[in-house]
């Protein structure tokens, strides 16, 4: 999916609101300095394409973040302010459900979900010194 | 862990080519952009060229435009820098390096390099 | 083309302060970022964003950056920060890094 064509503003008003307390949430108890930075975005469509790719894809170790409240909210954020973005999703649901696991909490899990911050918040604040 | 390992240095004619490789582990590779950067001998560290994550943007220094070309494979973990007509002023170490970066719809800029490899010799001579 | 511009040399006492500076045409508009390099060992970013410290770099290494200057300051100066120190920032499409800055713990 292009998410070129997303209302960013409104992207970032969801994760300022909910999606980043929820991140908090999930991450209680860990230093935000335990682990390096592995994955990176370099404006606003790929931050989403990676956080798309983290959130929802199964990695080793990790299976079971698509479940997550802030995975849930990522996901409805991008169905309303993505066009078209739900219909291609429409499969990728269908195929999770068939391999829907026990929720478990790995460290790879908390890992990838301070990866998935990083990328929050370089979507939320570009990198630009003078906006 | 996150490590980027050069090669394909070595000691190469004046006006001939060489071609360094750089390959990455342990970070998510295509969503980096990465730089080279070269040290001459008891010199300071000079930019040479950066390509973004998806390879769509290059740039070069002034020094190697037109002769150095930087590209990446990423189903491979890999940058390139294929170096055609080189010169003694080319001989140095090259660095291969991961860089923050960010662009808009105008530019690209490119920050700092947090990770770096270990460096691979070029000796241009005759 | 832009040029950024630090002290060949700054020497300094083991304990004190040292202050590196790097200066360029309307810096402070750019993030300015700060490598150290020991004899041997590839460059290690110690300052990002002007004033960030990557994990894992000592708490005595800060930077600022403000109208044509960048400043490394190491407080407390210890003798393995004896190094090379480099300044670097983006301009038109180019990276550009100071010419870099030999500190000596004396």
């Known amino acids: 999916y292009d998410f070129t064509n997303c209302d960013f503003e409104k992207i970032k008003a969801a994760y300022l609101s909910t999606i980043s307390k929820d991140l908090i949430t999930y991450m209680s108890g860990t230093k935000s300095t335990e682990f390096n930075n592995t994955v990176s975005c370099s404006n606003r469509p790929h931050c989403l394409t990676e956080i798309q790719s983290l959130t929802f894809n199964p990695t080793a170790g990790c299976a079971s973040l698509a479940k997550e409240m802030f995975a849930m909210k990522t996901k409805a954020a991008l169905a309303i302010w993505c066009p078209g973005y739900s219909e291609t999703q429409i499969n990728a649901t269908q195929a999770m459900k068939k391999r829907r696991k026990r929720k478990v909490t790995t460290n790879k899990c908390l890992e990838q979900v301070s990866q998935l911050q990083g990328l929050w918040r370089r979507f939320n604040r570009p990198l630009l010194k003078q906006q | 862990q996150v490590q980027l390992v050069e090669s394909g240095g070595g000691v190469v004619q004046p006006g001939r080519s060489l071609r360094l490789s750089c390959a990455a582990s342990?970070?998510?590779?295509?969503?980096?952009?990465i730089h080279w950067v070269r040290q001459a001998p008891g010199k300071g560290l000079e930019w040479v060229a950066v390509?973004?994550?998806?390879?769509?943007?290059?740039y070069y220094a002034d020094s190697v435009k037109g002769r150095f070309t930087i590209s990446r494979d990423n189903s491979k973990n890999t940058l390139y820098l294929q170096m055609n007509s080189l010169r003694a002023e080319d001989t140095a170490v090259y660095y291969c390096?991961?860089?923050?970066?960010?662009?808009?719809?105008?530019?690209?800029?490119?920050?700092?390099?947090?990770?770096w490899g270990q460096g691979t010799t070029v000796t241009v001579s005759s | 083309s832009y040029e950024l511009t630090q002290p060949p040399s700054v020497s300094v006492s083991p304990g004190q302060t040292a202050s590196i500076t790097c200066s360029g045409d309307?810096?402070?508009?750019?993030?300015a970022c700060w490598y150290q390099q020991k004899p041997g060992q590839s460059p290690v970013l110690v300052i990002y964003?002007?004033?960030k410290r990557p994990s894992g770099i000592p708490e005595r290494f800060s930077g600022s950056n403000s109208g044509n200057t960048a400043t490394l300051t190491i407080s407390g100066t210890q003798a393995m920060d004896e190094a090379d120190y480099y300044c670097?920032?983006?301009?038109?499409?180019?990276?550009?890094f100071g010419g870099g800055t030999k500190l000596t713990v004396l």
């Open positions: 670097q920032a983006w301009d038109s499409s180019t990276v550009v």
């Open positions: 342990g970070f998510t590779f295509s969503s980096y952009g």
């Open positions: 309307k810096l402070g508009d750019k993030y």
């Open positions: 390509i973004s994550y998806d390879g769509s943007n290059k």
């Open positions: 390096a991961r860089g923050d970066s960010w662009n808009d719809r105008l530019n690209y800029y490119f920050y700092d390099m947090d990770v």
């Open positions: 964003q002007d004033n």
